[in-house]
């Protein structure tokens, strides 16, 4: 059976053993061999069964006496075989042994759970000799107990080429119970049940858990460890933590916060980056994600104008980097831009509107119905035109921008001419006689030179011609028009 | 299936004493506090306390200590309210419950009318 | 202790009418439970924990609310559903009942 001592237990005496005299008294060690230096507490296990030595790992020597007796076979004494004490306490335990003289160079190691304890270990040998035999003892100790040195402890002897094994001794460390899953925090969709686990260990076992929930026990009787608690499902934040209970009294978790999923807060700081004439540049700060992860944003932009029919322009992006260029906008126009992010649950509210402008552009179409003729008695090229929409002028048109290219017998000449805003015709020098003259008109505003009209050419004669009509711009279809005068 | 089966009515004089008995199966017994509660006669209920049947222990609400005892016999998986000095308003029918987690009283007992009359 | 308090103590209604019963808490609570009573027969649970439905019982009952103020709700009345219903909080002990609701027939 297994021997079992409990901290309150009396230390036992250093060593009971079957050698005469007392060890206090006549029985000074000889040697003493320290593994380790260290406090030796007062609470020491020892051998209680000296007599009987154990059955288990016996060497039996070969050599015999004088008188031919062969000698006992060697085993380590019984001892105690189970010790219970409280984590942070010190012990002391011990195997014993009497090993006959002729013997020579035997050490003790220590296992536990069939590893060799090696380094620092407060492991101490003692030896006692006598006229035949030599008593040894190998004693261990533990100055606090932690949970970790739980486990089971055996002596090794090497003698005569076998190994002598002595039986285990089994610490058993107890304290208050010790997490190995706590709850953790959690975001969560309201009024939706989810799952939360706390398992706590001995020794002692068991260990019972309680739930707490907003400093409110869930369970009024205990639950064996793991628990696992379903929430039925929450309204508002709440702080769940868990006890676990054992022998030795109570140990509570880690309290964690469980948030509810809502829609995020509107973004804030909505910026202007970057303008051009079609297109802004904006950034804004994300407001606060609701405990859900931002999916998408939303930028809504409408025309600052009072006369605009109040339509609203969206455009949807990801809602990183938190930075959008909106594109597609009307030159030299003012905007109400406004942003929204969304998570799981739904769309925030619109981030405070911001006023932005874009600047002037180029003109995006070229003026209209160019018609050339040739003004031969002042030997002139007269070319009109129409101005381009309003709204496609991207700007206040500050002129325009001709260009006339002069083609003869191989011989190609581009000339460029600017001309105010306010007219819609224009007179050029001929150039060149018995030449092409093909003509192109462009708007011009601050913010650049729109596109140049569809070429529209013109034949100048010799000298001497008389007939003579105007060119103009092709109708539709009709790819490069000459007109020969 | 979940089961609470209580004991009959009682008549009893004033100053006698009543044992209501509550037998609980289909659950391990152990693991959850049966509750007691209180229906005077046309009024509603009222919760009397219940008793942890892991640890025996038993907590009474206000109104409810002295004279009402809980007690369980776990080997037959029972719990008892005893009301001793009776009185005649302590006429009423009195229930048996299971307490789940968050104090629901999941499941009941059919009831057992207690009349305190001379 | 929290006192729980139903209104409106009686409410009259015809069948297939919605009902709508209320319990207010003296203080926060974490969740309400409700039982329904009738005449003889013990409480039966009904809505667990302010919003679940206990087993076996229809989907036109419902049960909503947070903090202090909580409500049941009968979608469309049938005959079998005149009863007295009470409110039961959960957050501290002593565990208190509301003072009931009695739903008859109009």
């Known amino acids: 059976a297994i021997t079992e001592a409990r901290e309150e237990a009396k230390p036992y005496p250093l060593f009971p053993g079957p050698f005469p005299g007392s060890l206090q008294t006549d029985h000074t060690p000889l040697l003493s061999l320290p593994h380790a230096s260290g406090y030796q507490p007062a609470l020491m296990f020892s051998p209680t069964q000296p007599g009987r030595p154990h059955t288990g790992n016996v060497a039996i020597p070969q050599v015999t006496s004088v008188e031919s007796k062969p000698l006992p076979p060697l085993a380590f004494k019984h001892t105690v075989g189970h010790i219970i004490l409280s984590e942070h306490k010190g012990v002391k335990f011990n195997c014993s042994i009497s090993v006959p003289n002729i013997y020579q160079d035997t050490t003790i190691s220590w296992w536990k759970d069939g590893k060799e304890l090696l380094g620092a270990h407060h492991a101490i040998t003692q030896f006692y000799p006598d006229d035949e035999v030599t008593a040894i003892i190998a004693s261990f100790s533990i100055t606090s107990v932690q949970r970790s040195d739980n486990g089971s402890y055996i002596c090794k002897m090497k003698i005569n080429n076998e190994e002598i094994v002595s039986d285990p001794i089994y610490i058993e460390v107890q304290g208050l119970p010790h997490f190995t899953k706590q709850p953790e925090s959690m975001n969560v969709t309201r009024n939706t049940a989810f799952n939360l686990t706390c398992q706590a260990v001995g020794p002692p076992e068991p260990v019972n858990i309680f739930w707490v929930q907003n400093s409110s026990r869930v369970n009024e009787q205990p639950e064996k460890s793991p628990s696992v608690l379903t929430v039925p499902g929450l309204t508002e934040m709440a702080v769940f933590s868990c006890e676990a209970h054992n022998d030795k009294g109570l140990t509570v978790s880690k309290g964690v916060q469980i948030n509810i999923k809502a829609i995020p807060s509107p973004p804030t700081e909505v910026s202007i980056r970057n303008s051009t004439a079609h297109s802004i540049l904006i950034s804004w700060v994300p407001g606060f994600d609701g405990y859900s992860p931002f999916r998408n944003c939303s930028i809504q932009v409408k025309e600052a104008d009072p006369l605009s029919n109040g339509s609203v322009m969206i455009f949807n992006t990801s809602a990183l980097p938190h930075l959008y260029q909106i594109k597609q906008l009307q030159a030299l126009a003012n905007y109400s831009i406004g942003v929204s992010c969304m998570n799981e649950i739904g769309w925030s509210a619109v981030s405070p509107w911001i006023l932005a402008s874009t600047t002037e552009g180029a003109p995006s179409v070229a003026p209209l119905n160019v018609t050339v003729f040739l003004n031969e008695s002042s030997d002139n090229v007269d070319i009109r035109w129409m101005k381009p929409p309003t709204k496609q002028q991207d700007g206040e048109l500050v002129g325009y921008r001709i260009s006339h290219v002069w083609q003869s017998a191989g011989i190609s000449k581009e000339l460029l001419e600017e001309v105010g805003q306010n007219g819609s015709r224009a007179r050029i020098s001929v150039q060149v006689h018995n030449a092409t003259c093909t003509v192109r008109i462009a708007a011009v505003t601050r913010g650049g030179v729109g596109p140049f009209s569809d070429p529209v050419k013109i034949f100048i004669p010799a000298h001497g011609w008389v007939d003579y009509a105007p060119s103009s711009t092709p109708a539709p279809g009709n790819a490069d028009p000459v007109l020969i005068i | 299936q979940v089961q609470l089966v209580q004991s009959g009515s009682e008549l009893k004089k004033p100053g006698a004493s009543v044992k209501v008995s509550c037998k609980a199966s289909g659950y391990t017994f152990a693991n959850y506090g049966v509750h007691w509660v209180r229906q005077a006669p046309g009024q509603g209920l009222e919760w009397m306390g219940w008793i942890n049947t892991y640890q025996g222990e038993p907590t009474y609400a206000q109104g409810f200590t002295g004279r009402f005892v809980f007690s369980l016999d776990t080997s037959v998986s029972t719990a008892y309210l005893q009301i001793s000095s009776l009185k005649a308003e302590d006429t009423a029918v009195y229930y048996c419950?299971?307490?789940?987690?968050?104090?629901?009283?999941?499941?009941w007992g059919q009831g057992t009318l207690v009349t305190v009359s001379s | 202790e929290i006192v729980l308090t139903q209104s409106p103590a009686t409410l009259s209604l015809s069948p297939g009418e919605r009902a709508t019963l209320s319990c207010r808490a003296s203080s926060s609570v974490g969740y309400m439970h409700w039982y329904q009573q009738k005449p003889g027969q013990a409480p039966r649970p009904l809505i667990y924990?302010?919003?679940n439905l206990a087993s076996g019982i229809p989907a036109r009952f419902s049960g909503s609310g947070s903090g202090t103020s909580y409500t049941l709700t009968i979608s469309s009345l049938e005959p079998e559903d005149f009863a007295v219903y009470y409110c039961q909080q959960w957050s501290s002990n002593p565990r208190t009942f509301g003072g009931g609701t009695k739903v008859e027939i109009k």
């Open positions: 924990a302010t919003s």
């Open positions: 419950t299971r307490g789940a987690r968050y104090a629901y009283m999941d499941y």
